[in-house]
């Protein structure tokens, strides 16, 4: 058993049929010694008396809010949550496995630049009685500070018969050094509580590996005289790190016909312009990637040829 | 050339070679070994790699003030990785194919380090750890980790040389 926060405790249980469970001793937070009784949740049934209460926690029915009273007065509460371990593996019932980039990916994180700011998100099908708490640091043995906001519901989607809820959180490294080569990864820890079930999820990454620039901006076409060719130009996204002579991007320009089956013409360039042939009903798209480190490409910015 | 006296390196040449290094480092990894990377665990060999840290002057402002600190750090890193790529981690079994990009990567590391420090000039080189031969079964995982680490190192070096070529070239 360990304390998650004041008056909230997590009991770690090996979860299998007829498991013995954990013996837990609760102590009433009071100077009083006599006449103390204990109840669980809304029940008025007295579970025991005295300053301490010993219980055997085996299942969710044994978890909940234990309250000690004297007379009609509430003295203190202890909320017990359960953390299940099945076959040596902690349960992951609350969050959905996003399976990208690999199986057992529950948290996904992205950064738009090297400033030390990043966003993480996760998915669940649970709509109520759900709370999240997020902590983060750079490194684990001698952690350096990363400040995370509160997790918020950022999207709702319908998937088949059930709804899926996306939560996200923004974090900022306290003393970011954008130009340095990271040697210690960022650690992100999410505590998830659904009713009386506790679970924790972690992710470890370097900012460089989660970079995904915003799409290029101000994408424009300029027809070239007496030619089917056009000059495409664009600019670095506003959110990208500066100076651009240091934090350089590379770009992919694609000409795509109306039909998905049509052959795509692609050009790669480090410049912010390119000359391509504009076919009728086609569109021109440009996306960006860090020039020197192969992290994610941005989403496409597109304009029609016509 | 970045000689200890403090004259300027051939920024444009260094930019071109460092960008090539980035490409090679990504094409060399993931190396197709003979098996999956099943053997996990941190290996000492990759814990000692030199990193370009915050105080090394490799940020745009630091380069403007005095690029020598940063160039010396990059030089140390290039020599370190060049030694690693020549060690039995890469020369031993499972053998790399003759056309593996690791050979080119190795040569390019040497080439850039020589551009930064021509014959006859000597910067203090960081102590290269005496690489005790790796157990053969550790080599695939070590290659994987070293190349991942090298990708990050050469990315910062390439940014430095790109910025230098754009803003510090005579």
């Amino acid at each position: 058993i360990w304390e998650l926060k004041k008056d909230v405790y997590v009991v770690e249980l090996d979860w299998y049929p007829d498991a013995p469970g954990e013996m837990v001793v609760l102590t009433c937070d009071t100077p009083e010694e006599d006449g103390i009784t204990w109840t669980l949740d809304q029940s008025s049934e007295v579970l025991g008396s005295g300053k301490t209460l010993t219980i055997q926690v085996k299942e969710f029915g044994d978890a909940g809010q234990y309250t000690c009273h004297k007379g009609g007065e509430v003295l203190s509460h202890s909320l017990l949550l359960l953390h299940k371990k099945e076959d040596g593996i902690w349960s992951t019932d609350i969050l959905k496995d996003q399976k990208e980039p690999k199986n057992k990916t529950f948290l996904r994180c992205e950064a738009k630049n090297y400033s030390g700011r990043f966003t993480c998100w996760w998915l669940t099908t649970i709509s109520t009685d759900l709370t999240f708490s997020v902590k983060s640091s750079r490194g684990s043995s001698d952690p350096q500070g990363v400040t995370c906001g509160a997790a918020t519901l950022s999207a709702e989607r319908v998937r088949g018969d059930n709804k899926e809820y996306e939560y996200s959180v923004e974090c900022q490294e306290d003393s970011a050094c954008p130009a340095a080569e990271e040697s210690l990864p960022i650690e992100v820890m999410v505590d998830a509580v659904h009713k009386l079930k506790y679970e924790n999820y972690t992710s470890s990454f370097f900012i460089r590996d989660i970079i995904k620039p915003d799409p290029p901006k101000n994408l424009q076409l300029k027809p070239l005289k007496n030619s089917r060719q056009v000059e495409v130009s664009w600019e670095y996204p506003d959110t990208w790190s500066t100076p651009h002579s240091y934090f350089s991007l590379t770009f992919c320009v694609q000409v795509q016909g109306k039909s998905k089956r049509e052959k795509k013409d692609r050009v790669f360039t480090d410049k912010t312009s390119a000359t391509v042939i504009c076919r009728k009903n086609a569109s021109i798209s440009v996306r960006a990637q860090d020039r020197y480190y192969s992290s994610s490409w941005s989403e496409w910015a597109s304009v029609p040829c016509s | 050339r970045a000689v200890p006296g403090g004259s300027s390196p051939a920024w444009t040449q260094c930019q071109q070679l460092s960008q090539k290094l980035c490409t090679l480092a990504w094409s060399a990894h993931p190396l197709v070994g003979h098996m999956d990377l099943r053997e996990e665990g941190d290996e000492e060999t990759t814990n000692d790699v030199p990193h370009i840290q915050c105080g090394d002057g490799c940020d745009p402002q630091g380069l403007r003030d005095n690029s020598q600190f940063c160039l010396q750090r990059i030089h140390q890193g290039l020599i370190f990785y060049e030694k690693l790529l020549g060690s039995d981690i890469f020369t031993g079994e499972p053998s790399l194919l003759p056309d593996s990009p690791v050979g080119q990567l190795h040569a390019s590391l040497l080439g850039l380090s020589q551009l930064l420090q021509p014959e006859g000039h000597h910067w203090e080189t960081q102590q290269i750890p005496s690489l005790s031969p790796s157990q053969p079964w550790q080599r695939l995982l070590l290659r994987f980790k070293i190349l991942r680490s090298l990708q990050a190192f050469v990315a910062v070096a390439a940014r430095v040389f790109a910025h230098g070529a754009a803003t510090l070239s005579p």
């Epitope: - | 020549g86 060690s87 031993g92 157990q135 079964w137």
Partner: antibody
């Protein structure tokens, strides 16, 4: 094509030393290790050690440490093994080979230790 | 050190028969195992690398299997030129060690 060509047979007296060579051709000498293997008459194979021609790094079987010395010369793409304090049980064929998974073997050098 | 044990020591077979040679390591060596064939007066020749990977130029009748500490070399239909001594080798950790060999002879 790849070849490892070893020096000729040697007859040496007990207590003396012998130095044999292994010249590589047909591949980049510094790219792979050179292992040395002993095979006594009618017996199995025993690994002596290897050298990394790129950096002269060596690894020895404890059994041969101190008596076997491995060296190489990049300029001639040649690896060498010196065996000292020879005794009769050192009579054997000694093979050089590149990485195990490449199947580049020398033809062997027969060393006979006899008074 | 890892001890490699081969069995049987000698195998008498007729051409065309299927032959199975066994090699056991004293501890797990994953799939870092090599099989060699050696004929009198010749250097060993690599038949199989990493327990089951074939070598170009080696006839397809030679195949390897196993992982961990138990390994097998199979000759699907033994030919007259296959009679020789076969060695297995630990390529997993130092010192590299070889099995004592299995001699495959004509019945």
């Amino acid at each position: 094509q790849v070849q490892l060509v070893q020096s000729g047979a040697e007859v040496v007296k007990p207590g003396a030393s012998v130095k044999m060579s292994c010249k590589a051709s047909g591949y980049t000498f510094t790219r792979y290790l050179i292992h040395w293997v002993k095979q006594a008459p009618g017996q199995g194979l025993e690994w002596i050690g290897y050298i990394n021609p790129y950096n002269e790094g060596t690894k020895y079987n404890e059994k041969f440490k101190g008596r076997a010395t491995l060296t190489s010369d990049k300029s001639t793409s040649t690896a060498y093994m010196e065996l000292s304090s020879l005794r009769s049980e050192d009579t054997a064929v000694y093979y050089c080979t590149s990485n195990w998974d490449l199947d580049y073997w020398g033809q062997g050098t027969l060393v006979t230790v006899s008074s | 050190e890892i001890v490699m044990t081969q069995s049987p020591a000698t195998l008498s077979v007729s051409p065309g028969e299927r032959v199975t040679l066994s090699c056991r390591a004293s501890q797990s060596i994953s799939d870092y195992l090599y099989w060699y064939q050696q004929k009198p007066g010749q250097a060993p020749r690599l038949l199989i690398k990493f327990a089951s990977q074939s070598i170009s130029g080696i006839p397809a009748r030679f195949s390897g299997s196993g992982s961990g500490s138990e390994f097998t070399l199979t000759i699907s239909s033994v030919q007259s030129e296959d009679f020789a001594v076969f060695f297995c080798q630990n390529g997993h950790s130092f010192p590299f060690t070889f099995g004592g060999g299995t001699k495959v002879e004509i019945k």
